[in-house]
């Protein structure tokens, strides 16, 4: 049961369930917005973001966006609602416990994005091919 004094705060808008009907709770994500990064040509990187923030809404997940152009590399870390596009892209992998980077087409830059739904999961961003979601073992991890 929901504790009584939470019911004022927990109206019908706030009670969010996943695909299995389990109640979703506000998540902790790294949240540094856009920062310069030294993450390049690596299988995985830590965000080096020292801010762990509680997401505003229970449905929000952690997101990381890695961008490289002629001048610099940046890493963006935020909370975001997967029902809404981010940088014009749908968050397809929001149910994943790990932040596995996927390349997106953006003119003039290299653009990777990942989303995930476990606490601080956007602290460790994974580029390695071995984590590609075509791997059936990973799908088991994500959806079990």
């Amino acid at each position: 049961t929901i504790p009584p004094h939470v019911q004022k705060s927990v109206n019908n808008d706030m009670i969010v369930t996943d695909n299995n009907g389990a109640v979703k709770f506000p998540q902790l994500c790294k949240f540094c917005d856009v920062r310069f990064s030294t993450c390049d040509n690596q299988k995985s990187c830590m965000s080096n973001c020292s801010i762990t923030s509680i997401c505003e809404k229970p449905q929000e997940v952690c997101v990381a966006v890695w961008r490289k152009n002629d001048e610099n590399i940046t890493l963006e870390t935020v909370c975001h609602d997967p029902k809404l596009p981010y940088h014009d892209f749908i968050l397809e992998d929001a149910a994943s416990p790990k932040c596995i980077m996927k390349e997106k087409k953006k003119p003039g830059e290299t653009f990777f994005m990942c989303s995930c739904s476990s606490d601080e999961c956007n602290d460790n961003i994974i580029f390695s091919e071995e984590y590609n979601t075509s791997n059936p073992d990973l799908l088991l991890v994500i959806f079990q």
Partner: antibody, heavy 121, light 107 residues
Framework: QLQVQESGPGLVKPSETLSLTCTVS??????????WGWIRQPPGKGLEWIGS???????YYNPSLKSRATISIDTSKSQFSLKLSSVTAADTAVYYC?????????????WGQGTLVTVSS | EIVLTQSPATLSLSPGERATLSCRAS??????LAWYQQKPGQAPRLLIY???NRATGIPARFSGSGSGTDFTLTISSLEPEDFAVYYC?????????FGQGTKVEIK
């Protein structure tokens, strides 16, 4: 009515590991509607968050403890414990194992009475 | 981590008077601020969460306000049992942090 009770040795020697147990009665720690954790309060001072968890999610630790803290969970006994390694006099405090609603995680709506741990040789 | 600064450190008032306690955050904590009351030898007790919501069983004389970096706890008319130490706590950025406390003492 869910209640928590802290237990453990009142005296620990410097450089040793402090071990405390929190027993939950009147409910289950595997109820994910509630978050659990540890907070401490040095004598005459303010409160410090040590770490917290809710069932099915990883435990969050305060980075200031530099990996000295470990929280483990035994759902069969409805208990969770705190181990704090390499203690010094600065770790002398009343240790609480509070509970809060996960929907507003970080808010504490129920506290045990706390247990005083003194670090001294 | 976010630093919470409470003022004043001590507030000397008489029963029946109005108490106004302040909590200022080093950066925005949105509305994620709670207030706790602690009496000597006891654990803290939740009064207010998310800036202005009273916890179960808390009398209406306790009210909270504010958002961003500046918050206030008001006790409209002090009862004898209200003399205690009051802590604010933020949960916007983790770890959650507490202010150093304001002691409300009998004048």
């Amino acid at each position: 009515q869910l209640q928590v009770q802290e237990s453990g040795p009142g005296l620990v020697k410097p450089s040793e590991t402090l071990s405390l147990t929190c027993t939950v009665s009147g409910g289950s720690i595997s109820n994910s509607y509630f978050s659990w954790g540890w907070i401490r309060q040095p004598p005459g001072k303010g409160l410090e968050w040590i770490g917290s968890f809710y069932y099915g999610e990883k435990t969050y630790y305060n980075p200031s403890l530099k990996s000295r803290a470990t929280i483990s969970i035994d759902t069969s006994k409805s208990q969770f414990s705190l181990k704090l390694s390499s203690v010094t006099a600065a770790d002398t405090a009343v240790y609480y194992c509070p509970r809060g609603p996960t929907m507003i995680r970080g808010v504490i709506d129920s506290w045990g009475q706390g247990t005083l741990v003194t670090v001294s040789s | 981590e976010i630093v919470l600064t409470q003022s004043p450190a001590t507030l000397s008032l008489s029963p029946g008077e109005r108490a106004t306690l302040s909590c200022r955050a080093s950066q925005s904590v949105r509305s994620y601020l709670a207030w706790y009351q602690q009496k000597p030898g006891q654990a803290p007790r939740l009064l207010i969460y998310d800036a202005s919501n009273r916890a179960t069983g808390i009398p209406a004389r306790f009210s909270g306000s504010g958002s961003g970096t500046d918050f206030t706890l008001t006790i409209s008319s002090l009862e004898p049992e209200d003399f205690a130490v009051y802590y604010c706590q933020q949960r916007s950025n983790w770890p959650p942090t507490f202010g150093q406390g304001t002691k409300v003492e009998i004048k």
